[in-house]
Interface confidence: low
């Protein structure tokens, strides 16, 4: 006869590890009893559970509540036991001794191997602003074993580094992915993805880029001189820019405090029916945490009395 | 502003125990490892170990395994270094120091050290 | 273990004058792209504070007077011009795997 079993068992962690050890003998052979072991180099050999015809499953107590037979219906030749809930601390050599009656003693040796699956974290780096040079956009630590492979997935133009440490029974792969800001990564997604033997399908972690920016100001509303003449109603002078994060906008006037019926609405600055009065230069001032920007216009009221007038528009930052 | 508050001086006998604490406030606390550094009198630095403050998770230089023991209560926001079986080589100030990246940035914020005098 | 081992062990350079330090690391602390070496200044009395960080790269709020170079296993700190306030003790640290590990320590004073 001979013993049926594997050099190699791999189970991932908290699963139950079936250890196995099934004899191959005439019809006329019985197996009297399996012994198995756990041979480990540092703590040399010890017993794991004890199966026999007569008395059942004795379990070393270190062991207990962790060593059960496969469930029925069980062949009287499988001495195969399962490893509950395996445990990183389980990994290691296990051996399988057999004796027969009447062909004698059969032993198998084997490889107990837990993958234990990693558990990614993505860090985000400092944060990003426009004009900085290469820059740690996100770093990602994945620890396993055996080693994760840590890799980027993103449109984003960067350059990714990894880099490992190794622990007696896994390993920390940390890779970290650095760019140059720029405004149009703003919102892109960086995904760190985590490959690993113990997981079923790549583990993703996904960081929203966010770059600080400040955009140029400009004022809209001047562009129809009819619009900007005594009486009429409705004249509105827009602020355009735009930032991360979203700007915050101030209008003030540079020759005086801004005319009675003036109403600033965030970015818009809404005129009453328009007088001479309005006539001036009115500056939009548009900041965010990052910076500050001012564009300014001269708006001058025209009365129909005197058409000679034109409209000036002069824009400065 | 980060700051890393560490326990006082301690005067302890040969063969007993101490207990460091390091309180750390002005950051996320579970987000960054705590690392401890022993300086023995005018020597260099010797890394003791680093604990995650998130899962109380320890890595240990093997030089340290069998005389600190690292550990976190993250409720008060405070990192614990045991010292075991105290002798006169273990007579050092001990730092506590912030990783903000696993490392790769060296340690940037460090507590102001605790002296630990090993004396019969 | 990685041994960095640092030289000189003290050094005393005139006001205004260039202090070199080095560090060999005994295996390549360099990826394609970054160095994982670090370099402190420590004060009697006081924690190290963090001056260099990846080799070259000035952590914020250190006098642009301090710089660092080097890749592989050679690594080196300059301070141009010395001023009397840069009299410290400087170490050289790696964060390449675990154990991190220091250099010995070079004691800068003032001639």
């Known amino acids: 006869g001979e013993l049926e079993t594997s050099d190699v068992v791999t189970v991932v962690l908290g699963q139950d590890a079936k250890l196995p050890c099934f004899y191959r003998g005439d019809p006329d052979e019985q197996v009297g009893q399996v012994a198995w072991a756990r041979v480990d180099p540092n703590e040399g050999i010890r017993e794991l559970a004890l199966l026999h015809s007569k008395y059942g499953l004795h379990v070393n107590p270190a062991y207990e509540d962790r060593v059960e037979q496969p469930p029925p219906p069980r062949d009287p030749l499988d001495g195969s036991v399962l490893l509950r809930n395996a445990v990183q601390a389980d990994e290691g050599e296990y051996e399988c001794r057999v004796s027969t009656f009447p062909a004698g003693s059969f032993q198998a040796r084997m490889r107990l191997r837990v993958l234990v699956p990693p558990l990614p974290s993505l860090n985000p780096g400092p944060p990003l602003e426009e004009g900085q040079g290469l820059t740690l956009a996100a770093s990602c630590t994945a620890e396993g074993s055996p080693a994760p492979s840590v890799t980027w997935d993103t449109e984003v133009k960067g350059t990714q580094s990894s880099r490992s440490f190794t622990h007696p029974r896994s390993a920390a792969v940390t890779s970290e992915f650095h760019l140059v800001p720029s405004r149009s990564m703003n919102g892109q997604p960086l995904t760190c993805v985590v490959s690993h033997p113990g997981l079923l399908q790549d583990r993703r972690i996904t960081h929203t880029l966010q770059v600080a920016f400040l955009a140029e100001a400009s004022v809209r509303g001047l562009e129809d001189q009819n619009l900007w003449q005594v009486g009429r109603e409705g004249a509105t002078l827009k602020c355009l820019s735009e930032g991360q994060p979203p700007p915050k906008y101030n209008w003030t006037r540079l020759d005086g405090p801004l005319p009675s019926g003036v109403r600033v609405k965030g970015d818009t600055l809404g005129f009453p029916p328009l007088t001479t009065e309005h006539s001036g230069v009115y500056v939009c001032h548009v900041s965010n945490e990052l910076s500050s920007r001012d564009s300014q216009v001269t708006v001058e009221v025209l009365d129909p009395e005197d058409p000679g007038k034109q409209v000036d528009l002069v824009s400065a930052s | 502003e980060v700051q890393l508050q560490q326990s006082g001086p301690d005067l302890v006998k040969p063969g007993a125990s101490v207990k460091i604490s390091c309180k750390a406030s002005g950051y996320s606390f579970t987000g960054h490892y705590m690392h401890w550094v022993k300086q023995s009198h005018g020597k260099s630095l010797e890394w003791i170990g680093r604990?995650?403050?998130?899962?109380?998770?320890?890595s240990y230089n093997q030089k340290f395994k069998d005389k600190a023991i690292l550990t976190v209560d993250k409720s008060s926001t405070t990192a614990y270094m045991e010292l075991r079986s105290l002798t006169s080589e273990d007579s050092a100030v001990y730092y506590c120091a912030r990783d903000p990246l696993g490392g790769s940035y060296g340690f940037a914020y460090w507590g102001q050290g605790t002296l630990v005098t090993v004396s019969a | 273990d990685i041994v960095l081992t640092q030289s000189p062990a003290s050094l005393a350079v005139s006001l205004g004058q260039r202090a070199t330090i080095s560090c060999r690391a005994s295996?390549?602390?360099?990826?394609?792209?970054?160095?994982?070496m670090h370099w402190y200044q420590q004060k009697p009395g006081q924690p190290p504070k963090l001056l260099i960080k990846y080799a070259s790269n000035l952590e914020s709020g250190v006098p642009a007077r301090f710089s660092g170079s080097g890749s592989g296993t050679d690594f080196t700190l300059n301070i141009h011009p010395v001023e009397e306030e840069d009299t410290a003790t400087y170490y050289c640290?790696?964060?390449?795997?675990?154990?991190?590990?220091f250099g010995g320590g070079t004691k800068l004073e003032m001639k």
């Open positions: 640290q790696h964060s390449w795997e675990i154990p991190y590990t």
């Open positions: 604990v995650n403050p998130n899962n109380g998770g320890s």
């Open positions: 295996q390549s602390v360099t990826t394609s792209s970054y160095s994982y």
